[in-house]
């Protein structure tokens, strides 16, 4: 879980390590802070649950490019 | 942290084309979203265009829709922006930029610059 004590530098210290359903998520955003130990991804579900997780995995990748998708018609 | 580094600017005469280039440091690559933004003198920042991380998708502002084109390499850590026929009205100094959450064409939605580089079409 994210974890934001010394707000306002959030971060990631354990991924989850279950694929999530696009369809539970409502956003994300980028963790690159140089003081969190790990770059990370934290999406947000439908019901205001943040889980963090591995930007290299490409599930991660694709549910990211989704989420944009949703917010945007492509002009492939 | 992604450090970005544009090629590409020049003078042209309308009609002609141009190709940019941004390649990018870091180990990530693929799993940021890429845009292009332009800024023209006394303007604002202004979305161009942006691309998915699997580069499936390309999304474009209306005023380069058909002429403009963006494309990336995963494997070379490197984005591109085809411009052709282009107009005056396409001066500006060019970005491009690597995502930090959802919103694609908003500035902020973007948390890596490059430096950016000189686009001059003269009539």
């Known amino acids: 879980q994210p974890d934001a004590i010394n707000a306002p530098v959030t971060c990631c210290y354990n991924f989850t390590n279950r694929k999530i359903s696009v369809q539970r998520l409502a956003s994300y955003r980028r963790i690159t802070s140089s003081k969190c130990p790990k770059e990370a991804v934290i999406f947000k579900t439908i019901v205001a649950k943040e889980i963090c997780a591995d930007p290299k995995q490409k599930w991660v990748q694709d549910s990211m490019d989704h989420l944009d998708k949703q917010t945007q018609t492509p002009k492939t | 942290e992604v450090q970005l580094v544009e090629s590409g600017g020049g003078l042209v005469q309308a009609g002609d084309s141009l190709r940019l280039s941004c390649a990018a440091s870091?180990?990530?690559?693929?799993?940021?979203?890429m845009g292009w933004f332009r800024q023209a003198p006394g303007k604002e920042r202004e979305f161009v265009a942006a691309?998915?991380?699997?580069?499936?998708?390309?999304y474009y502002a209306d005023s380069v829709k058909g002429r403009f084109t963006s494309s990336r390499d995963n494997a070379k850590n490197t984005v591109y922006l085809q411009m052709n026929k282009l107009k005056p009205e396409d001066t500006a100094v060019y970005y491009c930029?690597?995502?930090?959450?959802?919103?694609?064409?908003?500035?902020?939605?973007?948390?890596?610059w490059s430096q950016g580089t000189q686009v001059t079409v003269s009539s």
């Open positions: 691309i998915s991380r699997s580069g499936a998708s390309a």
């Open positions: 930029a690597a995502s930090s959450r959802i919103g694609v064409d908003d500035p902020e939605a973007y948390g890596y």
């Open positions: 870091g180990r990530t690559f693929s799993s940021y979203r």
